[in-house]
């Protein structure tokens, strides 16, 4: 049993290393920036995010392309809830430094939680997304 779990753990690690989660990060960043645009951005806090969407992306086509690529990547974790959780936490960690303020962080987290469902996948059950950057040791 333990041996099987160690093998499963290694498989998850290699899956995570192979996965390109960047499209997920781009899709989520564009999504929350589009939401900010619809609700009106603070004119005194221009976006400094490197993923700031182009006018083409703002119409949604670029983002839907990112979403499709993102879902393809997440699909690899469909049969491993723990690994799905790891992937989502990795996305959260990668973006935590780029999120400006508590509100944007909460918005990003909300969209991240909905991501598996948007991809037609099952959301992980025991999965804490309240991740602090740099605060966790790896499996």
């Amino acid at each position: 049993r333990q041996q099987w779990e160690l093998q499963g753990d290694r498989r998850c690690q290699s899956q995570l290393e192979r996965a390109n989660l960047r499209p997920c990060e781009q899709h989520l960043m564009q999504k929350i920036q589009r939401d900010e645009d619809s609700y009106g951005r603070d004119p005194y806090s221009p976006s400094q995010d490197p993923y700031s969407p182009s006018p083409y992306d703002r119409r949604g086509a670029g983002s839907s392309q990112h979403q499709e690529r993102c879902c393809n990547e997440l699909n690899e974790f469909e049969n491993n809830q723990r690994c799905m959780c790891e992937a989502l936490q990795q996305i959260m960690e990668n973006q935590s430094d780029r999120l400006q303020g508590r509100q944007q962080e909460q918005q990003f987290k909300r969209e991240l939680r909905n991501l598996p469902q948007q991809c037609g996948l099952r959301a992980p059950q025991r999965c804490d997304l309240e991740v602090e950057s740099g605060g966790r040791d790896r499996y």
Partner: antibody, heavy 123, light 110 residues
């Protein structure tokens, strides 16, 4: 008011069997995970087993897997723990608890506990 | 030997603040939610904190929970003699597919 009442505790010989029951009331039993937790005399808490709302998934402490079986009767709002091949290490107070675990992005937590029932394994 | 490590005992005077730590690994606290329980002598445990920081209704705001990395902390302010009890942390461990409890911490109010 949520109530969990355990029964079936006894003094049993090593190698023997026992079935604990937990009658639940005051909440919709079929919508909650349920959990057994035990505490050896003078020791800390030890999780024993979880069962999903519909009984389709069960998790066990390694040392009881294959000997204990957790089950539930949602029509009667009763949780069970069938314990076989008992040893002195299984001695303690067994608590029936309601587990707040949800379907996604949630953790196990035990928001209601029974009063506990004593199981003693001794010759 | 519990996989979640808590100090065996802590003590403080009435009115003071105390913190109880719970240390784990990436496969438990690092990825999962932590809950905290109070067990008064001779009684069943009671839930104090769940999902790292949330308090069930009826639990005073003197009790607080936090989590950072692979450690969690229970804070109790305005200590009262009635807080003398054993305190336990708990979380799911993905390696073991099991809920783990810490070894427990005995709080003495001097």
């Amino acid at each position: 008011e949520v109530q969990l009442v355990e029964s079936g505790g006894a003094l049993v010989q090593p190698g023997g069997s026992l079935r604990l029951s937990c009658a639940a009331s005051g909440f919709k039993f079929s919508t909650f995970y349920m959990t057994w937790i035990r505490q050896a005399p003078g020791k800390g808490l030890e999780w024993v087993a979880n069962i999903k709302q519909d009984g389709s998934e069960k998790d066990y402490l390694d040392s009881v897997r294959g000997r204990f079986n957790i089950s539930r009767d949602n029509a009667k709002s009763v949780l069970y723990l069938q314990m076989n091949t008992l040893s002195a290490d299984d001695t303690g107070v067994y608590y029936c608890t309601r587990n707040g675990l949800q379907d996604s992005y949630s953790g196990d937590f035990f928001d209601h506990w029974g009063q506990g029932i004593l199981v003693t394994v001794s010759s | 030997q519990s996989v979640l490590t808590q100090p065996p005992s802590v003590s403080a005077a009435p009115g003071q603040k105390v913190t109880i730590s719970c240390s784990g690994t990436g496969s438990n606290i690092g990825h999962n939610y932590v809950s905290w329980y109070q067990q008064l002598p001779g009684t069943a445990p009671k839930l104090l904190i769940y999902d790292n920081t949330k308090r069930p209704s009826g639990i005073p705001d003197r009790f607080s929970g936090s989590k950072s990395g692979t450690s969690a902390t229970l804070g109790i302010t305005g200590l009262q003699t009635g807080d003398e009890a054993d305190y336990y942390c708990a979380t799911w461990d993905a390696d073991l597919s099991a809920v783990l409890f810490g070894g427990g911490t005995k709080l003495t109010v001097l």
